[in-house]
């Protein structure tokens, strides 16, 4: 029988009446078009909905947009279009919502052809009021808030000017011309690339990387011959053109660009690319594209300086620059990432790592599933997960994998069970232990979301026909109840719940179609009466993350420590609540060779935990360029994995000596870097 249909499933009592009393319909008085939805702040209940409708006329496009606001998590909406003077809002810029709980919103308006600049509407009170501001430039990008100070905004203009505002968009100043890309760093620092000759495209590989730490009063050139740059965790990366040819290399800085080191990564040619897949303050996952149009490359993981890299995964699927990769950080369990590889036979397979890229394996076959037609051996196969690539290929996959940091261990994804990803209609699978084991949760494709930190999972069938039924589970997807939320089915377009998975409200969006018109409609369901009491201590049970062998003293040790969590019992139907904090108890592990990566000049042979010297470097002094100085490395081949907290046990020796020699590693040395002030 399908999951949740056997007799052992405990029914939630009287749920139909409870949900009926907490289902709120809102019909939007618009012609259909497009709709975008944004949450303003955290736990505020404020939602902004922008509907836009385009009518292509012979010589121009006539557009109309409406703005709606809810302050009760979508149960009721008020038309506030008059607050923005009934202006047409440009949807390609979306709604720029300020960081944290600043309550700031910026909407970019469509203006007529001949105007001197663009127009924005600004709110700093969670969209209760808006101020119209005419800009001295036409914006090319959405306004970007400084993560540290939501009053500081930056934007690029259509003429490649870099504009900054220090008073939340009231007054704007152009701080630099000829800018290609700009990003906020930490401490209100702005990094940007500039071109000298023709344009961003023409100067690609000859751009300069600049930094301003005082919002444009003074500048420092921190790099030349730049192709592109990126920020990840505490690392600043730049891909730099080599002197002699058209190849580029990654350089890395951990001091905001004052000093640079060449990353020990392969160089790439014109048609190849680098991509930061994930980064934190400890390390980075870097994808390096293979030469030729292969659609794959190699994942490397960095040391704590972002300089020494270990090969992590071969044949990693990544189609083109800015293309599709399935690389997914499983946020519900530390150290877990899922991605896809392209096999020699061109089939796509899913791989998972539980130790931040140290080792990759196939996903264990779900116990309640059969191997499909892709499997050579009907008893031995794996689960393969559909993610961005499958979605881009228009397979019947409505959603990417889902995990939430406060729903510990839970991962939900579409998948197929065989030797490779199948093009057949997928089912939905769930893991409650961060990806070690999986169970089929729902038959066929579904939209899904996590509420109340995992206390409720909600799903809606993906169908081309109108729908009126929602499914929910209070036991991490084991048993499902169905609820008919409306008598009149709607064409479903999306599920919306407050980011962070702490809410107990879900909004079902769609449209109704009649003979002459179609209208947007939303149904917001509050599950608070299903989870009618607050969870108590007895509702939680102890779980050791990454446990594979209870008899092993090091069971659960990942990156040098293990963590016990308090997890909600599957049988407990109660509210974690909005203030729920994950309870965890870490304990340090003894060091083993698994806690170290291979140092510069060393590598790990397959299926071996020992690091051995690279043959081509045997007997040579290990000298490399670091922060613009020649360094001499004395090592027995090991360096602690970034973020690893192990103590005692194995302790390999390592020493770095400064050779007091200068080296520039194809890059500006600090002495040559120039500064200027406005």
């Amino acid at each position: 029988s399908a999951p949740g249909e056997d007799e052992e499933c405990g029914r939630v009592r009287d749920f139909v009446a409870k949900l009926a009393n907490n289902t709120h319909q809102h019909v939007f008085d618009d012609l259909r078009g497009s709709v975008s939805l944004s949450w303003v702040g955290d736990s505020t209940g404020v939602i902004l909905v922008l509907t836009t409708f385009h009518v292509p006329l012979v010589i121009m496009t006539f557009g109309q947009s409406k703005l709606y606001r809810s302050e009760d998590y979508g149960k009721n909406f008020k038309d506030i279009t008059d607050l923005i003077n009934n202006t047409f809002i440009r949807t390609e810029f979306g709604m720029a919502i300020g960081p944290e709980n600043s309550g700031k919103v910026v909407l970019t308006a469509e203006v007529s052809g001949g105007s001197r600049g663009g127009r924005i509407f600004r709110s700093s009170d969670f969209a209760k009021n808006f101020v119209q501001t005419d800009l001295p430039f036409h914006p090319l990008t959405q306004m970007m808030y400084s993560p540290q100070n939501s009053d500081y905004l930056l934007a690029l203009s259509t003429e490649n000017g870099l504009w900054v505002s220090k008073n939340f968009g009231g007054k704007w100043e152009e701080i630099h011309k000829a800018v290609c890309l700009a990003k906020w760093g930490s401490d209100n620092t702005i990094f940007f690339t500039t071109y000298a000759n023709g344009s961003c495209k023409a100067d690609l590989g000859a751009l300069e990387l600049w930094r301003t730490s005082d919002l444009g009063k003074s500048f420092k050139t921190i790099g030349v011959k730049i192709y592109s740059f990126g920020l990840g965790g505490r690392f600043l990366f730049a891909s730099v053109m080599a002197d002699k040819d058209t190849t580029r290399r990654i350089h890395v800085s951990t001091d905001q660009g004052d000093t640079w080191s060449m990353a020990q990564l392969p160089s790439v040619g014109q048609e190849q690319f680098y991509s930061i897949l994930a980064a934190n303050d400890d390390m980075v996952f870097m994808h390096v594209d293979e030469p030729g149009d292969t659609g794959f490359g190699t994942i490397f993981t960095s040391d704590d300086r972002g300089i020494v890299y270990s090969k992590s995964l071969d044949r990693h699927l990544y189609t083109t620059t800015g293309g599709e990769t399935d690389f997914t950080n499983v946020t519900s369990l530390r150290g877990v990432y899922i991605t896809s590889v392209l096999s020699e036979d061109n089939s796509i397979q899913t791989m998972i790592t539980f130790d931040q890229g140290g080792r990759w394996t196939h996903l264990r076959k779900p116990e309640n599933s059969e191997c499909d037609a892709t499997a050579k051996n009907k008893n031995e196969c794996s689960l393969h997960i559909h993610a961005s690539y499958s979605i881009s290929q228009k397979l019947n996959v409505p959603m990417a994998p889902l995990s939430e940091p406060n729903a510990v261990g839970i991962v939900i994804a579409h998948g197929s069970v065989g030797d490779a990803i199948s093009v057949m209609v997928p089912d939905v699978y769930i893991s409650d232990d961060g990806g070690y084991s999986w169970t089929k949760m729902l038959e066929g494709p579904h939209y899904y979301t996590i509420l109340d930190s995992g206390g409720i999972i909600v799903a809606i069938e993906h169908s081309s026909r109108p729908i009126n039924v929602i499914k929910f589970s209070t036991d991490e997807g084991q048993c499902w109840q169905t609820y008919t939320f409306t008598r009149d089915p709607i064409y479903f377009t999306g599920l919306a719940s407050e980011p962070g998975a702490r809410s107990m409200n879900i909004s079902i969006w769609g449209f109704t179609e009649s003979f002459l018109t179609s209208q947007w409609v939303s149904y917001t369901i509050d599950f608070k009466d299903i989870l009618e009491r607050n969870c108590e201590e007895k509702d939680y049970t102890i779980w050791l993350a990454h446990s594979t062998d209870p008899e092993d003293y090091e069971d659960g040790c990942i990156l040098g420590y293990k963590e016990q969590f308090l997890r909600l019992r599957k049988s407990s139907v109660c509210q974690n609540g909005r203030d729920y904090v994950v309870t965890k108890q870490p304990s340090i592990c003894l060091c083993s060779l698994e806690d170290f990566l291979c140092d510069f000049g060393y590598y790990r042979p397959e299926n071996d935990s020992k690091c051995v010297e690279q043959p081509e470097l045997k007997g040579h002094d290990l000298e490399f360029c670091l922060y613009g100085r020649e360094e001499h490395l004395t090592t027995n081949g090991y360096r602690k994995i970034p973020g690893d907290k192990c103590q005692g046990g194995v302790n390999p020796v390592r020493e770095v000596k400064d050779l007091k020699k200068k080296c520039t590693s194809n890059f500006l040395s600090p002495e040559k870097q120039n500064s200027k002030s406005n």
């Epitope: 052992e8 405990g10 232990d433 070690y436 084991s437 007895k538 049970t541 102890i542 779980w543 050791l544 993350a545 990454h546 446990s547 594979t548 209870p550 008899e551 092993d552 003293y553 069971d555 659960g556 016990q564 019992r569 599957k570 049988s571 407990s572 108890q585 304990s587």
Partner: antibody, heavy 124, light 107 residues
Amino acid sequence: QVQLVQSGAEVKKPGASVKVSCKASGYTFPGYLMHWVRQAPGQGLEWMGWINPVSGSTNYAQKFQGRVTMTRDTSISTAYMELSRLRSDDTAVYYCARGKRSSGWYEGYGMDVWGQGTTVTVSS
Amino acid sequence: DIQMTQSPSSLSASVGDRVTITCRASQSISSYLNWYQQKPGKAPKLLIYAASSLQSGVPSRFSGSGSGTDFTLTISSLQPEDFATYYCQQSDVSPITFGGGTKVEIK
């Protein structure tokens, strides 16, 4: 092999306290919950609570709340159960028992290793 | 607290007999039910965990079934060493509770 060895029999007066020890060997002591279960003469089994050796956190049955204290010393792989304000109906055999684990889950799978039991007699 | 009701409280059987003991929970406990065997003067011994999983080292003549509220322990062919008291125990919700026991005696 995996075993739990408990301290010897005790005779106590009403109102006194008793502290029973349980030394674990043959397995990773912090890796499992330690439960305490008692059995009055001719009666069934009664669960008293457990201790998590990793954190020292405890879960006591409501009936014993305020009278029972469970502690552990991980350096010597030993768990302790102290019962205070003893009454004559506390006369029983007291068992420590290791909670069986299913990979990461600590509860729900019974108690797979038991101590030999400690007889506590409360009599004036 | 969840009440666990075992039946019968005692039974007489002969070697080779098929013996069935039932256990009912006062509310659903999913599959979080365990069975123990206890002989006089000895500590209990885990036979079945999670309603139907056989603990390692336990003879295959012991089996468990059920989920929700109704559970069964079956001894397919009673052996002389099986004469003992059997307890069910729920571990779904704290506090953990045991059934009153079923004493299996020689007929």
